[in-house]
Interface confidence: medium
């Protein structure tokens, strides 16, 4: 983050920023910056390894919800989305793209298809769906 | 913006950000940033008149909603909030808080009640209500 | 077109009901309330109430409070008026009208053709 | 509930006439008025909108003004088709009302 101490002195107060103020990212142009998380709803409707394939394509992963405190903005998300969550049959555990367990408590997992692949609704809920069923989709890049 | 450019040689190459990559705002701390425009979203309840002193205590103005490209984010958006747009009696029209005039296309608006206010819903919507119902609320920054 | 196409002539007895439709085509159905209007023969033009379509609130004159009904179905694209009681004075047409506050559209800027509605004994 | 008073309650007049038709409301009502036209047997069509805008498809001879709570329907030059009876009706608050209308004749 780019705060506003940092950019006054580097400029001499030539870039009057109130002190709450920031900037946030760096993000992909054109995409959504959040608490210096980066996202971006795709309304093409894909399947969940196309889905995938076109955040990774990016430079990105799908959505990987890891704090509802930091990740607010997705309550009031309208609709159903891919987001970077699967089954893992061997244990029957879900986990997210980077491997990382699903936190207990994050979602409320529903139980709307039987498929390893999950979509994103509102108010942190995830919604079990065949993989192969496309969708529209939420890519996320977190920034350093 | 901070363009990935201009940060490089700044940063004489320290900060390695993609060249289609940026900063977006500034923004006051925690809003969302999109197209270098600030909003947040508050989930407590306030009449309309409320609601525009919460987002002027702030520095911000309750959502104009201004294009359909540069704020498609909003097409996500769950539920009613209250935004910026009040009718003028005097000649029927529906302005901006600014003074603005609502462009035509800009926002389907649906007879929800009789009122003096509108309530933004998800895909663009504008539904009338009565200015003294409290309802969560949209504020919006413009950055230069 | 927009076009709305109410039921035909009904003949009541005194204390019955009768339920009015109006069948909505040419535009979005949700996006404007539905009114509903009634002429006595010879005499003027009476508001009974309006429907929002979309959430299917109504607000009814309280003239009619507690013997109207106004409904709206959106799959059909249709809304109806049931009047309960009725008496040798709601002998009149009645009209449904697109517009429900005309706070952004023009009030009433479609009609239906009129339903006449004769109570009598 | 808000009275409408519209005058007069008949009017002869003939081709070319320039008329006027007056809705007065018991209380400020912005302005939250419409103008009908019916002819026997026929729906209402409306006229104008917001006291003084002109509907879409209705002749500019039609216009409407508002002075405080008074409104006024003028007919700028009467033509054959526009003998019908006139309403105002007001959309202030509930519940909404009608003036009891002007018949406006052929001299």
């Known amino acids: 983050i780019w705060s506003a101490v940092f950019l006054n002195s580097l400029f001499n107060q030539e870039v009057q920023i109130p002190l709450t103020e920031s900037y946030c990212g760096p993000c992909p142009k054109n995409w959504i910056c959040y608490k210096n998380n980066c996202y971006q709803f795709f309304n093409e409707s894909k399947n969940w390894y196309e889905s995938q394939a076109s955040c990774m394509s990016q430079n990105a992963s799908l959505l990987k919800v890891y704090s509802k405190e930091d990740q607010d903005l997705l309550k009031l998300v309208k609709s159903y989305h891919w987001m970077g969550l699967v089954h893992i049959p061997t244990n029957g555990s879900w986990q997210w793209e980077d491997g990382s367990i699903l936190s207990p408590n994050l979602l409320t997992i529903i139980e709307m298809q039987k498929g390893d692949c999950a979509l994103y609704a509102s108010s942190f809920k995830g919604y079990i769906e065949n993989c192969s069923i496309p969708n529209t989709y939420i890519c996320m890049q977190r920034t350093v | 913006i901070w363009s990935a450019v201009f940060l490089n040689s700044l940063f004489n190459q320290e900060v390695q950000i993609p060249l289609t990559e940026s900063y977006c705002g500034p923004c006051p701390k925690n809003w969302i940033c999109y197209k270098n425009n600030c909003y947040q979203f508050f989930n407590e309840s306030k009449n309309w008149y409320e609601s525009q002193a919460s987002c002027m205590s702030q520095n911000a103005s309750l959502l104009k909603v201004y294009s359909k490209e540069d704020q498609d984010l909003l097409k996500l958006v769950k539920s009613y909030h209250w935004m910026g747009l009040v009718h003028i009696p005097t000649n029927g029209s529906w302005q901006w808080e600014d003074g603005s005039i609502l462009s035509p296309n800009l926002l389907t608006i649906i007879e929800m009640q009789k009122g003096d206010c509108a309530l933004y819903a998800s895909s663009f919507k504008g539904y009338i209500e009565n200015c003294s119902i409290p309802n969560t609320y949209i504020c919006m920054q413009r950055t230069v | 077109q927009v076009q709305l196409q109410q039921s035909g002539t009904e003949v009541k007895k005194p204390g019955a009901s009768v339920k009015v439709s109006c069948k909505a085509s040419g535009y979005t159905f949700t996006t404007y309330g539905l009114t509903w209007i009634r002429q006595a023969p010879g005499q003027g033009l009476e508001w009974m109430g309006w429907i929002s379509v979309f959430n299917g609130s109504p607000n009814y004159s309280l003239k009619f409070q507690g013997r109207v009904t106004m409904t709206a179905d959106t799959f059909t694209n249709t809304a109806y008026m049931e009047l309960r009681s009725l008496r040798s004075d709601d002998t009149a047409v009645y009209y449904c009208?697109?517009?429900?506050?005309?706070?952004?559209?023009?009030?009433?800027?479609?009609w239906g053709q009129g339903t006449l509605v004769t109570v009598s004994s | 509930a808000i009275r409408m008073t519209q005058s007069p309650s008949s009017l002869s007049a003939s081709v070319g006439d320039r008329v006027t038709i007056t809705c007065r409301a018991s209380q400020g009502i912005r302005n939250d008025l419409g103008w009908y036209q019916q002819k026997p047997g026929k729906a209402p069509k409306l006229l104008i909108f917001a006291a003084s805008n002109l509907e879409s498809g209705v002749p500019s001879r039609f216009s409407g003004s508002r002075f405080g709570t008074d409104f006024t329907l003028t007919i700028s030059s009467l033509q054959p088709e526009d003998f019908a009876t006139y309403y105002c009706?007001?959309?202030?608050?509930?519940?909404?009302?009608f003036g009891q209308g002007t018949k406006l004749e052929i001299k």
């Open positions: 009706l007001q959309d202030y608050n509930y519940p909404y009302t």
């Open positions: 009208a697109r517009g429900g506050t005309g706070d952004y559209y023009p009030l009433f800027d479609y």
